[in-house]
Interface confidence: low
Amino acid sequence: GTDSGSEVLPDSFPSAPAEPLPYFLQEPQDAYIVKNKPVELRCRAFPATQIYFKCNGEWVSQNDHVTQEGLDEATGLRVREVQIEVSRQQVEELFGLEDYWCQCVAWSSAGTTKSRRAYVRIAYLRKNFDQEPLGKEVPLDHEVLLQCRPPEGVPVAEVEWLKNEDVIDPTQDTNFLLTIDHNLIIRQARLSDTANYTCVAKNIVAKRRSTTATVIVYVNGGWSSWAEWSPCSNRCGRGWQKRTRTCTNPAPLNGGAFCEGQAFQKTACTTICPVDGAWTEWSKWSACSTECAHWRSRECMAPPPQNGGRDCSGTLLDSKNCTDGLCMQNKKTLSDPNSHLLEASGDAALY
């Protein structure tokens, strides 16, 4: 055309886009039948003219489907939703080793789409543990392994450990370790780890407790240092002396072994005997002096005191009046306070 400004129309309009294959907004999820309660499986798809469940390769009866259509709030799309119930009886009736499974098939004008398979299993938890923890007595600071193999179950049981009925949290107490095979390890046994330990297995069906294992952390006794030797039993000559130690470093605890060996030692001892001093004989009297006295002396030498023996007691010098010789009566008398009646003082001999 020659009209400028007029719009040129296409010879033909493109056809509307083809409807896409159905897309699942919700696929059926694995489920467990607890006791006799049936499970619900649910599918949501868009766009979908029909949705049906297929279980174990066979179509589920149309009557067993509950179907509804509505707007998806999140997308504003018109979606189709379907749900079925699966009973315990249906699952039990499936013979063979395969699990009971269901999947959705959705149709649109573009074709069909299959959802994932959802497996339906009968949940259970057997009563007996495959392995239960054993009580044990362990030395202080040693590593302890408590084993637990939970009962067989579907779904597989989760395991937790109790210490005196409190749940052990290894992130709070790093002395505890939980291994992937459900064992409990006490890294270094402390006295406070003396306790009752229980393995607990639980799943959606039940909770089972193992027998309780008592762990006793013991301390073997250790000797204290030896005390000083006692004095020799005899003050003089051959005797005995002893020393002792006690099983207190540490003292045995929680059934730990008592110390091995002797708590006391005895040994012979010889003490050199003390010799008490004794006087020699008195000397002869001296001549009469100008002081009208004469004298005699003796010594603590028969024998002298030895090895801590006692000194002699008594006087070293003895004097008495005399009137012969050079005596002058007007001189000092024996009653004079400065009289030379001397006593031994200490170990000095005075003359």
């Epitope: 044990k136 040693h142 590593e143 392994l145 084993q147 370790l177 939980l178 992937i180 890294r187």
Partner: antibody, heavy 115, light 106 residues
Framework: EVQLVESGGGLVQPGGSLRLSCAAS????????IHWVRQAPGKGLEWVAY????????YYADSVKGRFTISADTSKNTAYLQMNSLRAEDTAVYYC????????WGQGTLVTVSS | DIQMTQSPSSLSASVGDRVTITCRAS??????VAWYQQKPGKAPKLLIY???SLYSGVPSRFSGSRSGTDFTLTISSLQPEDFATYYC????????FGQGTKVEIK
């Protein structure tokens, strides 16, 4: 004082056998986990085997399963590693060690597998 | 089997530097991770156990932390005696070591 002393290393031909010993002192191996860990020349650490003697509880690395056997004689306070069908790639320093977070190690013993 | 991916494989640093080594577990290992230091010709030495517990006798400049399946060893101020190779190890399901990180002098 805790000590671990390995012995028994040496030169052996491929296909041959060797028995390593780990003598422990300062603690009772009955109540601890004992490991063998190896280190090939210039390479990193590789865990080999584990025993908890109180239970006779043992584990092995896939690389040695069926060829190596870990054992313990608690009366001698000693752990062992029996190595059979040795290969060139088993050449390494073998360490004996104690505990889950391994707190004590021996000084190591060299095993050379070569023709 | 659980893999422990350690990084970097080597690093150069100076005395006084802050050094960080990481290990990633291929699946959850709780806090069951230990860190070791090894010097040439010597046996490894335990530094950290249970992800963040400092082993007795180890200087406080060493620390460990956990975030999910990521584990970190930090040396707050590198000392001359810290130049060595460091290994992580998980002991949650059997035992696996990381490949090692060599800390060298810059």
């Amino acid at each position: 004082e805790v000590q671990l002393v390995e012995s028994g290393g040496g030169l052996v031909q491929p296909g041959g056998s060797l028995r390593l010993s780990c003598a422990a002192s300062g603690f009772n191996i009955s109540y601890s986990s004992i490991h063998w860990v190896r280190q090939a020349p210039g390479k990193g650490l590789e865990w080999v085997a584990y025993i908890y003697p109180y239970y006779g509880y043992t584990y092995y690395a896939d690389s040695v399963k069926g060829r190596f056997t870990i054992s313990a004689d608690t009366s001698k306070n000693t752990a062992y590693l029996q190595m059979n069908s040795l290969r060139a790639e088993d050449t390494a320093v073998y360490y004996c060690a104690r505990g889950y977070g391994i707190d004590y190690w021996g000084q190591g013993t060299l095993v050379t597998v070569s023709s | 089997d659980i893999q422990m991916t350690q990084s970097p494989s080597s690093l150069s640093a100076s005395v006084g530097d802050r050094v960080t080594i990481t290990c990633r577990a291929s699946q959850s290992v709780s806090s069951a991770v230990a860190w070791y230091q090894q010097k040439p010709g010597k046996a490894p030495k335990l530094l950290i156990y249970s992800a963040s517990s400092l082993y007795s006798g180890v200087p406080s400049r060493f620390s460990g932390s956990r975030s999910g399946t990521d584990f970190t060893l930090t040396i707050s101020s590198l000392q001359p005696e810290d130049f060595a190779t460091y290994y992580c190890q998980q002991h949650y399901s059997l035992f696996t070591f990381g490949q090692g990180t060599k800390v060298e002098i810059k």
